[in-house]
């Protein structure tokens, strides 16, 4: 790397969030090089003394990998040549949260960028009519959340109404003792209305909608990660 000390290359990362127990991606791109053997990728984590991952001379070099990442990391080897240094992190743990550095060396020079990685649990809510209840009741359930979220109900007809007096939310710890199941019940619902159950923590926001008419029930849900800056 004759000139690598004198030039800097552009490295770009994207803040992201990982869902505990699932696989996550730490995104990083750089100015590509024509020769794979000239590219070195190092992923480091603040406060962790071993490497998260290293890729050099066209293959993984994991002798100095920290044990907390053992067997859980991979780069997209076939995409390195086009400037993709993103890291796949398997089985995301709560302790994976923190500041990561994507450090790149190529024949053009070197560069790095930091990335904030949040970890938690988030899942899509499902809203159903609770036919077992004595009055018209909706039940909103989401299987995995962490940290503990807030739950807010809203309705299309009564916009701005506060449903806290007519709803009840409970959090039940899941078997792995970290994530929790969220159950929220809304009482005294009226027909021909669309209700939304909004679950939010500092990592994600999810909404489950249900439209109840005399002839049909329509459901829709979506989830959005917060603070992910492109």
């Amino acid at each position: 790397f004759g000139i690598s000390g004198r030039h800097s290359i552009t490295v770009t990362t994207v803040a992201s969030a990982g869902n505990i127990g699932e696989d996550g991606i730490l995104s990083c791109t750089f100015e590509p090089d024509i020769k794979l053997s000239d590219i070195v990728i190092q992923w480091l984590k603040e406060g962790v003394l071993g490497l998260v991952h290293e890729f050099k001379e066209g293959k993984d070099e994991l002798s100095e990998q920290d044990e907390m990442f053992r067997g859980r990391t991979a780069v997209f080897a076939d995409q390195v040549i086009v400037g993709n240094a993103s890291l796949r992190l398997k089985n995301v743990q709560l302790t994976d949260a923190g500041t990561y550095k994507c450090y790149i060396i190529t024949s053009k020079g070197k560069g790095n960028a930091n990335l904030e990685y949040k970890t938690g649990a988030f899942s899509m809510p499902e809203v159903n009519v609770d036919y077992n209840a004595s009055s018209e009741t909706l039940r909103c359930e989401a299987p995995r959340w962490f940290p503990q979220p807030t739950v807010v109900w809203a309705s299309q007809v009564d916009q701005g109404a506060n449903f806290s007096e007519v709803s009840n939310t409970s959090f039940e710890l899941n078997s792995e003792n970290v994530t929790m199941k969220v159950v929220s019940v809304l009482y005294n619902v009226t027909i021909n209305n669309t209700y939304s159950c909004m679950i939010e923590n500092d990592i994600a926001k999810a909404t489950g909608d249900i439209k109840v008419t005399e002839s049909e029930i329509k459901r829709r849900s979506h989830l959005q990660l917060l603070n992910s800056k492109a």
Partner: antibody
Framework: QVQLVQSGAEVKKPGASVKVSCKAS????????MYWVRQAPGQGLEWMGR????????VYAQKLQGRVTMTRDTSTSTVYMELSSLRSEDTAVYYC?????????WGQGTLVTVSS | DIQMTQSPSSLSASVGDRVTITCRAS??????VNWYQQKPGKAPKLLIY??SRLHTVPSRFSGSGSGTDFTLTISSLQPEDFATYYC?????????FGGGTKVEIK
Amino acid sequence: QVQLVQSGAEVKKPGASVKVSCKASGYTFTAQYMYWVRQAPGQGLEWMGRINPTSGNTVYAQKLQGRVTMTRDTSTSTVYMELSSLRSEDTAVYYCARGINWFDPWGQGTLVTVSS
Amino acid sequence: DIQMTQSPSSLSASVGDRVTITCRASQNIDTYVNWYQQKPGKAPKLLIYAASRLHTVPSRFSGSGSGTDFTLTISSLQPEDFATYYCQQSYTSPFTFGGGTKVEIK
């Protein structure tokens, strides 16, 4: 050059505590973990645990949990290993060693004798 | 914990002999194995790390293996090589050691 210098030999009574120090020089103290390994007379090597000098976070061998405490002083580049409720089977040479996935170098060792 | 079973526990050999020491891990540890040499009254010294990479030692020492089976070979034993050798896994904590192999003069 990288050096780890340990405190001198100790003789302790059963039930007492011992605190062994390990002073690092010749490298950035916070760049690598510090491990502790012990060796009973005529026996093999036993991994005791490690400390992250940056954060102070520790990992201990299960059999020593509750009796061992590893600390560090970044201002003097020194790590400490304290073992409490000593018993005769704790008689050993105690080593500190620097590393991530392999240990190099090692301290010269500290002989701790537990005897009534 | 991962067990490291080292064999033989001792061996007698002459200067110039080829010596092989083996280590077996109780589970797959990739190439996270290190070998140390210890002489009486001294601290252990790193010989080989990451299964096959020589530290600052003569080329007569070599290491091989991956997964569960690992070997330390001394191609031509020298007088200064009479010592006890330990393997160690660094795949996951606790970083356990093998029981040691004492290489004695025949």
